[in-house]
């Protein structure tokens, strides 16, 4: 037995026939000694005298809230519930299986942006006698602390014959950094209490991997002359994470009838405009996904065919680009060949993903697993690759981006990726560690020489131990590749010469 | 399934037109683009335009802009390229294909060899 | 328009090996980009589309990777009938285009 809060507590339950249950013993919160009687609920009957009162608890009907008191007067409340557990697992009646993105997936969260605010949402059948209560942290080890809203009734649906009621949440983490590559992964964890049944689920989650932005903005068309073609030009979201230079999205453009068995026209941009061919009664959508990270696209945002909205041009290209200097990032500190990182780094994420697209979709977090990716190098809140710390001086973000390439082209060089199951040299590991170690390269030139991070002694003996390992690098590295995309990215727009 | 079958060799004399066709079975016509790509022999590939059945829209590559013309006849499911002022560098093959994206091509016709020769 | 430069224009592979397949664009083209087979005598086979999206009932062992301007065609173990040549074609802009072709032969 455990106190939820104040007067409640949750009795755990192995739930079998002829269980013998748990013995609860509660005590009456009174200075008062004597003359003190128990009941349960709305009901008359005394179960027992005294300041304490054992009972033992089976099943629902032993469950509820015990009250005592004394000549008449309530001395004080305990509310029972009950926390089932049927062949070793939690009951999880309460909360609908979503089966989205796998099976056993109870609560969904998405965030529109990286400023540390993200929604989750749950569906239940039941309309009455329902509360929930989340809390949330970062990690869970030495938590960091998330504020989370009251959950609320956000939507009902008819699906069949049942009524479904989502809920929601917002959470906020108290000190955000956008920027960052997150090394800690958010703790939801969500209590719901049905009549007297108690239930908790939980997720775990990094922000990066619940992204899903708003559709684009304000969708232009400006019909081509003696074409066919349509230029059309949109906006990043307003809720979208800024400076656009940093916080880059690739685009997908689509022409489409109303029916998705309908043809339809078809191009991807990291731009803000593109030219597609328009034809009647067919629509015009965008929808936008993060540039450097495979996280969800957002939903389809459309506009018409027919009527080609304004003719304004709009061809702004969401911020990328920019000329680059030839020079490299020495020690001394000059600028690195920004335009070329930009484009070595882009073909990082882009590698790191083909690596091993299964592995976006894997749930790797196990027991353990938070210490086994504390040994790889993370770029934290404190190294300057956010936009302002790159304004201020690049070389600090460079040197632990450096340190990073290094760290992993070893990783990807050592057993773990050389020894069994092999891989060859020209897959796409053996490609993203030719460009790893190209881009670390770039940024220093021999000769000259940064601090590099120890690679730590993981030699896993068994070859699907190394395969969850590959598994577990790739992913961190697809993190780590993003943020140095977004830098350099960054660095081409505003910091070249 | 869906097939493109397209009509046989020609011979031709430079100055002249070639009317090619390819008729498409296995799917509702209108329902996806026709393209017209040719292979010149030894050569690689080269896109020549794309037709869309249902309005009779068009967009030819510029470098066949005003020599090229493609139409379809929703009556018989079939498509035709007719290519005007041959000039001997117009020998190849000419594929016609079919998909309901507008930038690939995904069902192929067999090829039909066009030679320009005097 | 924009130019398609696929390289080597030969490649010698003895079956059962890997073989990678280079495809660059003048300009940035994102992810749109297509892989296609064409043996002697036959039209073209579509294998790859949007840089790494398969179709289905082409063989696992040919997966596309790449953006921007770089573009990867890898076959994991080649098989006799891989032997053939094979093109990459944009579409991120009209006129579409292709490129040269590699050409890929028993080593």
């Known amino acids: 037995i455990w106190e939820l809060k104040k007067d409640v507590y949750v009795v755990e339950l192995d739930w079998y026939p002829d269980a013998p249950g748990e013995m609860v013993v509660l005590t009456c919160d009174t200075p008062e000694e004597d003359g003190i009687t128990w009941t349960l609920d709305q009901s008359s009957e005394v179960l027992g005298s005294g300041k304490t009162l054992t009972i033992q608890v089976k099943e629902f009907g032993d469950a509820g809230q015990y009250t005592c008191h004394k000549g008449g007067e309530v001395l004080s409340h305990s509310l029972l519930l009950l926390h089932k557990k049927e062949d070793g697992i939690w009951s999880t009646d309460i909360l609908k299986d979503q089966k989205e993105p796998k099976n056993k997936t109870f609560l969904r969260c998405e965030a529109k942006n990286y400023s540390g605010r993200f929604t989750c949402w749950w569906l239940t059948t039941i309309s009455t006698d329902l509360t929930f209560s989340v809390k949330s942290s970062r990690g869970s080890s030495d938590p960091q602390g998330v504020t989370c809203g009251a959950a609320t009734l956000s939507a009902e649906r008819v699906r069949g014959d049942n009524k479904e009621y989502e809920y929601s949440v917002e959470c906020q983490e108290d000190s955000a950094c956008p920027a960052a590559e997150e090394s800690l992964p958010i703790e939801v964890m969500v209590d719901a209490v049905h009549k007297l049944k108690y239930e908790n689920y939980t997720s775990s989650f990094f922000i990066r991997d619940i992204i899903k932005p708003d559709p684009p903005k304000n969708l232009q068309l400006k019909p081509l002359k003696n074409s066919r073609q349509v230029e059309v030009s949109w906006e990043y979201p307003d809720t979208w994470s800024t400076p656009h230079s940093y916080f880059s999205l690739t685009f997908c453009v689509q022409v489409q009838g109303k029916s998705a068995r309908e043809k339809k026209d078809r191009v991807f941009t990291d731009k803000t405009s593109a030219t597609v061919i328009c034809r009647k009664n067919a629509s015009i959508s965008v929808r936008a996904q993060d540039r450097y990270y495979s996280s969800s696209w957002s939903e389809w945002a459309s506009v018409p065919c027919s009527g080609s909205g304004s003719s304004r041009g709009g061809s702004g290209s969401g911020g990328s680009g920019g000329g680059g200097s030839k020079l490299r990032a020495v020690p001394g500190g000059s600028s690195p060949a920004w335009t070329q990182c930009q484009q070595l780094s882009q073909k990082l994420c882009t590698l790191a993903w083909s690596a091993h697209p299964l592995v976006g979709h894997m749930d790797l977090r196990e027991e353990g697993d938070e210490e086994t990716t504390n040994d790889v190098p993370h770029i934290q809140c404190g190294d300057g690759c956010d936009p302002q710390g790159l304004r201020d001086n690049s070389q600090f973000c460079l040197q632990r981006i450096h340190q990073g390439l290094i760290f992993y082209e070893k990783l990807l060089g050592s057993d773990i990726f050389t020894g069994e199951p092999s891989l060859l040299p020209d897959s796409p590991v053996g490609q993203l560690h030719a460009s790893l170690l190209g881009l670390s390269q770039l940024l220093q030139p021999e000769g000259h020489h940064w601090e590099t991070q120890q690679i730590p002694s993981l030699s896993p003996s068994q070859p699907w131990q190394r395969l969850l390992l590959r598994f577990k690098i790739l992913r961190s590295l697809q993190a780590f590749v993003a943020v140095a995309a977004r830098v350099f990215a960054h660095g081409a727009a505003t910091l070249s010469p | 399934q869906v097939q493109l079958v397209q009509s046989g060799a020609e011979v031709k004399k430079p100055g002249a037109s070639v009317k090619v066709s390819c008729k498409a079975s296995?799917?509702?016509?209108?329902?996806?683009?026709l393209h017209w790509v040719r292979q010149a022999p030894g050569q690689g590939l080269e896109w020549m335009g794309w037709?869309?059945?249902?309005?009779?829209?068009?967009e030819y590559a510029p470098k066949f802009q005003g020599r090229v013309t493609m139409t379809t006849d929703t009556s018989t499911s079939t498509a035709y390229m007719e290519l005007r002022s041959l000039r001997s560098d117009d020998t190849a093959v000419y594929y016609c294909?079919?998909?309901?994206?507008?930038?690939?091509?995904?069902?192929w016709g067999q090829g039909t060899m066009v030679t320009v020769s005097s | 328009e924009i130019v398609m430069t696929q390289s080597p224009a030969t490649l010698s592979v003895s079956p059962g090996e890997r073989a990678t397949l280079s495809c660059r664009a003048s300009?940035?083209?994102?992810?749109?980009l297509h892989w296609y087979q064409q043996k002697p005598g036959q039209a073209p086979r579509l294998l790859i589309y949007?840089?790494?999206q398969s179709i289905s009932g082409i063989p696992a062992r040919f997966s596309g990777s790449g953006s921007g301007t770089e573009f990867t065609l890898t076959i994991s173990s080649l098989q006799s009938e891989d032997f053939a040549v094979y093109y990459c074609?944009?579409?991120?802009?009209?006129?579409?285009?292709f490129g040269g072709g590699t050409k890929v032969e028993i080593k």
């Open positions: 294909n079919a998909n309901k994206e507008l930038r690939y091509f995904d069902v």
């Open positions: 296995g799917y509702t016509f209108t329902d996806y683009y």
């Open positions: 037709i869309d059945p249902e309005n009779g829209d068009t």
């Open positions: 300009q940035s083209i994102s992810i749109n």
């Open positions: 949007f840089a790494s």
């Open positions: 074609q944009q579409s991120n802009s009209f006129p579409l285009t």
